[in-house]
């Protein structure tokens, strides 16, 4: 499956808008970062089949997706900027739904891939945890913020190298 | 690759100004603040401030403020560390580094070369 | 500001030697604390981030450990290229504080 050339530039476009939700001065939250425990060795894209890496890539988009979904979220970001970044993860969705099914047909998916989606499920709860424990204030969503945009960088990568595969 | 490329060493006299640049490649520069530090000959580590790219927002030890101004052209991807007048104490090498802001990664983990400044009459 | 003091601000050793420098901080910042070496003409290089995790690159003789106030950079066993200046540095609060440096000389 090609994940066509839009999927990137929405890829990017995920980052910007990321960038700019910031809200509030980055260095008054320095004391709250976090080890969130990010499951790097799940990307670097060496160990899995495409439709591994796929499934692996979907499950953090549609993670990401779901943490941007709440009630929450909504209450943290500004608005418009939060709808256009959801509706950039959702075209991701989409493409990345439409690999999945053409890479992994009927086949069912290797064990060791259900254990790499459940680490970035994990990976996903502590974030929750976090925001749960502080409150969802304002630094707690910054520290998050920055997360994300790492992880995502990380996904951006393994798509690269997924390509460069083709 | 990673890379923090500092501007060449340079030689001043008192009163006068400078700037020196640091300019990263190899990574997504406004994902990254830019600290400097200082060490003047023969002495340790002395952090100066920071700077986010992504926005120009800073933060600066207080021993530097209004000593020094720290800016950034992310179209270019380098960061600036300047002085209006300088003085014989400023005599000193000057690092970059990069550090990864508020996602958990590793702080400082790449400098650059280091621009030496030397003020003298 | 948060003051970083390490000791010894100097040592003598000999090649083959376990080698302890620790670095105290005035107030608890948790595990915010990296160690790097520096060679005469050189930037500083990252050993340790996270008061205890090894950064990529470096060997595995180079260990730290601490959280809170007190913490420790071990050299297991000292090599030839390991003879430098060691600094702490915390990174929980601002300013960014470095320890005034331990240098690491050849007995």
């Known amino acids: 499956c090609d994940l066509p050339q839009t999927h990137s530039l929405g890829n990017r476009r995920a980052l910007i808008l990321l960038a700019q939700m910031g809200r509030i001065s980055h260095f008054s939250c320095l004391k709250d970062r976090h080890d969130f425990g990010f499951p790097e060795e799940e990307f670097d894209g060496h160990q899995f089949q495409k439709a591994q890496a796929i499934s692996v890539l979907h499950e953090m988009i549609q993670q990401t997706f779901n943490l941007f979904s709440t009630e929450d979220s909504s209450a943290a970001w500004e608005q418009s900027l939060l709808e256009k970044f959801s509706t950039e993860l959702y075209q991701q969705l989409n493409d990345l739904e439409a690999c999945v099914i053409q890479e992994v047909g009927v086949e069912e998916t290797p064990l060791m891939n259900e254990d790499s989606i459940l680490a970035v499920r994990k990976y996903f709860q502590r974030i929750t945890l976090y925001l749960t424990e502080k409150k969802y204030s304002p630094c707690a969503w910054e520290v998050v913020r920055a997360e994300i945009m790492r992880s995502l960088s990380f996904s951006t990568n393994l798509q690269k190298r997924l390509r460069r595969k083709d | 690759e990673v890379q923090l490329v500092q501007s060449g060493a340079e030689v001043k006299k008192p009163g006068e100004s400078l700037k020196i640049s640091c300019k990263g490649s190899?990574?997504?520069?406004?994902?990254?603040?830019i600290g400097w530090v200082r060490q003047m000959p023969g002495k340790g580590l002395e952090w100066m401030g920071i700077i986010d790219p992504s926005d120009s927002d800073t933060r600066y030890s207080p021993s530097f403020q209004g000593q020094v101004t720290i800016s950034a052209d992310k179209s270019i991807s380098t960061a600036y560390l300047q002085w209006s007048s300088l003085k014989a104490s400023d005599t000193a090498m000057y690092y970059c580094a990069r550090h990864p802001g508020l996602a958990w990664a590793p702080d400082f983990d790449y400098w650059g070369q280091g621009t030496l400044v030397t003020v003298s009459s | 500001d948060i003051q970083m003091t390490q000791s010894p601000s100097s040592l003598s050793a000999s090649v083959g030697d376990r080698v302890t420098i620790t670095c105290r901080a005035s107030?608890?910042?948790?595990?915010?604390l990296n160690w790097y070496q520096q060679k005469p003409g050189k930037a500083p290089k990252l050993l340790i981030k996270w008061a205890s995790s090894l950064q990529s690159g470096v060997p595995s003789r180079f260990s730290g450990s601490g959280s809170g106030t007190d913490f420790t950079l071990t050299i297991s066993s000292l090599q030839p290229e390991d003879f430098a200046t060691y600094y702490c540095q915390q990174l929980y609060d601002w300013p960014l504080t470095f320890g005034q440096g331990t240098k690491v000389e050849i007995k």
């Open positions: 190899g990574y997504s520069f406004t994902s990254y603040w």
């Open positions: 107030q608890s910042i948790r595990n915010s």
